[in-house]
């Protein structure tokens, strides 16, 4: 059974992940540039189901394309370069989902824009955090 200290650590990591995802979303929403149109044409894969930490595998698999799409935006929209930002997210995701079991992510048939993709994972973080508090 998870201890209160491990639950607290998980909660803090999820809150960190949530803040990073919200920061990216805010950066995109405040972004006024012709490249935004191009960014919004990229289709991300969405998880068929995202209710447990192991489902973060679906996010991990989309982090590389997320970085490359974010690269289109000028870095001034984000506190960190996309490369560093995604690297930070990757570290948190790996810790949260664990590496004990190899979970094969299942994707939904519909793809999503970067905004829809980020909102989906923001909702996921908020949902898990609420079950921990």
């Amino acid at each position: 059974a998870p201890t209160s200290s491990s639950t607290k650590k998980t909660q803090l990591q999820l809150e960190h992940l949530l803040l990073d995802l919200q920061m990216i979303l805010n950066g995109i929403n405040n972004y006024k540039n012709p490249k935004l149109t191009r960014m919004l044409t990229f289709k991300f894969y969405m998880p068929k189901k995202a209710t447990e930490l192991k489902h973060l595998q679906c996010l991990e698999e989309e982090l590389k394309p997320l970085e490359e799409v974010l690269n289109l935006a000028q870095s001034k929209n984000f506190h960190l370069r996309p490369r560093d930002l995604i690297s930070n997210i990757n570290v948190i995701v790996l810790e949260l989902k664990g590496s004990e079991t190899t979970f094969m992510c299942e994707y939904a048939d519909e793809t999503a824009t970067i905004v829809e993709f980020l909102n989906r994972w923001i909702t996921f973080c908020q949902s898990i955090i609420s079950t921990l508090t």
Epitope: R38, T41, F42, K43, Y45, E61, K64, P65, V69, C105
Partner: antibody, heavy 118, light 107 residues
């Protein structure tokens, strides 16, 4: 890390066929198309076509239509390119490279030299 | 097919020089253009995608610009490891087509 590892060099006679493989690792194989690009010795790069590993759908450059077949085996994350009716002009290094929408040819295989000689 | 005309076909430069390579498309390709570097006996390596976005890990001395039919790759200060052949690629329409290449040699 993302890797595309291709099969070894081949020597073929004119009129024969060659099948080159490209094994993907470090990412979900079905999320990215596999493209094939060739390069004759001392020449430029020539795009041959693409294959979607998820659906198996393909698109070939007109120049290779009818002679090239791109397939895959998703269970072993491997793509294949078969070129038939080989002629000496087909002597080249053949590369596989992945792409997804407008993120094109970001990782490449090491290349496979195909020599066509009688 | 969309023709990509690259110029010059070769150039000689010294370490520290600013180098500019141009690619002209036979029709409007919007921003569906990338730049690749190839060294002898090696696979090409992507430097820039969507005209001006730098591939992760590529030094910032490389930059791309342009739109429509005219595109440029610039190396702000040439380094010894930059001596190679550079190709542009359009992926706006099938078949995708490469420029004929620009060989950057040591002066």
């Amino acid at each position: 890390q993302v890797q595309l590892v291709q099969s070894g060099a081949e020597v073929k006679k004119p009129g024969a066929s060659v099948k080159v493989s490209c094994k993907a690792s470090g990412y979900r194989f079905t999320s990215y198309d596999i493209n094939w690009v060739r390069q004759a010795t001392g020449q430029g790069l020539e795009w041959m076509g693409w294959m979607n590993p998820n659906s198996g759908n393909t698109g070939y450059a007109q120049k290779f239509q009818g002679r090239v077949t791109m397939t895959r085996n998703t269970s072993i994350s491997t793509a294949y390119m078969e070129l038939s009716s080989l002629r000496s002009e087909d002597t080249a290094v053949y590369y596989c490279a992945r792409s997804r929408q407008w993120l094109v040819l970001d990782y490449w295989g090491q290349g496979t030299l195909v020599t066509v000689s009688s | 097919d969309i023709q990509m005309t690259q110029s010059p076909s070769s150039l000689s430069a010294s370490v520290g020089d600013r180098v500019t390579i141009t690619c002209r498309a036979s029709q409007d390709i919007r921003d569906d253009l990338g730049w690749y570097q190839q060294k002898p006996g090696k696979a090409p390596k992507r430097l820039i995608y969507v005209v001006s976005s730098l591939q992760s890990g590529v030094p910032s001395r490389f930059s791309g610009s342009g739109s429509g039919t005219e595109f440029t790759l610039t190396i702000s200060s040439l380094q010894p490891e930059d001596f190679a052949t550079y190709y542009c690629l359009q992926h706006n329409g099938y078949p995708w087509t490469f420029g004929q290449g620009t060989k950057v040699e040591i002066k």
